[in-house]
């Protein structure tokens, strides 16, 4: 079947922003919202924010959770407000996404 190929501008959503990449802001606007948890030097690092680049969100959000990192994504205004990413209790390790371009 032929693709529909809609010609639309991407919808932007307001997202909760928490973590170092947010600076002094408590929200950001992007094409997807996320909530993440990673282990850094033994500490649990929680972050929330948005993907301004759709493809970055698309790729990051399809990355399966690993013992060292988990990301949950959503589309909708403030949709990440009540989402807390959780690490799997067991599972194989995964390279993850080390090169976030969060701006």
């Amino acid at each position: 079947m032929e693709d529909e190929k809609p010609k639309v501008n991407p919808k932007l959503y307001m997202c909760v922003c928490e973590g170092l990449s947010c600076g002094n802001e408590d929200h950001c606007e992007g094409q997807q919202c996320f909530s993440s948890l990673s282990i850094n030097d033994g500490f649990h690092v929680y972050q929330k924010g948005c993907f301004q680049v759709y493809e970055q969100g698309k790729m990051t959000c399809k990355t399966p959770p690993s013992p060292g990192q988990a990301v949950e994504c959503c589309q909708g205004d403030w949709c990440n407000r009540n989402i807390t990413a959780q690490l799997p209790t067991k599972g194989k390790s995964f390279p993850g996404t080390q090169n976030f371009h969060l701006e």
Epitope: K5, Q52, E55, K58, M59, K62, T97, N99
Partner: antibody, heavy 119, light 107 residues
Framework: EVQLQQSGAELVRPGASVRLSCTAS????????MHWVKQRPEQGLEWIGW????????KYAPNFQDKATITAVTSSNTAYLQLSSLTSEDSAIYYC????????????WGQGTSVTVSS | DIQMTQSPASQSASLGESVTFTCLAS??????LAWYQQKPGKSPQLLIY???SLADGVPSRFSGSGSGTKFSFKISSLQAEDFASYYC?????????FGGGTKLEIK
Amino acid sequence: EVQLQQSGAELVRPGASVRLSCTASGFNIKDSLMHWVKQRPEQGLEWIGWIDPEDGETKYAPNFQDKATITAVTSSNTAYLQLSSLTSEDSAIYYCARYTSDYYTMDYWGQGTSVTVSS
Amino acid sequence: DIQMTQSPASQSASLGESVTFTCLASQTIGTWLAWYQQKPGKSPQLLIYAATSLADGVPSRFSGSGSGTKFSFKISSLQAEDFASYYCQQLYSTPWTFGGGTKLEIK
């Protein structure tokens, strides 16, 4: 080893359609976005679009919206580019490339498929 | 669409020299920029991603800098295998667009 193997050169008539293939090895295309790029002789690169093989979502450059259709078959780890209503302007080399969360860019490219449109 | 203006279109240089190319984006793209090398008859090869990061296996004589709208790409101490065409690409907003390319030739 990551490899993208593209189908062979095509000589096609104006007005016809052609389907090019790009078979991946060394990774699962479901874990990436598969892109297609056009390069005309002695000219630069033009991004055509991508497909997410996992869910079939596609995105196209406006110039290729009515020209190109990108599909993928995950069972054979292959992405396809179909070009329709061909004209001489479509004569070019077409590359497939993958985009992953390793670099958030197109890190591996196929060897290219030459398409010549001529009567 | 975001326009990418790459300069110069061509440049001649000698072995051992350094060269720098520039890419200007028509609007801010953060660090969503890649640089590729392409040799005649071959497919492009990723050199730099995220404006400044070197891809795996790429020699350290290649480097990238810049953010926002102005980006630079430098090759220090040119080797024979570096004579090729180079393209920048923005990945901030679709349609992803490439610069017109720089053809680097031996002087």
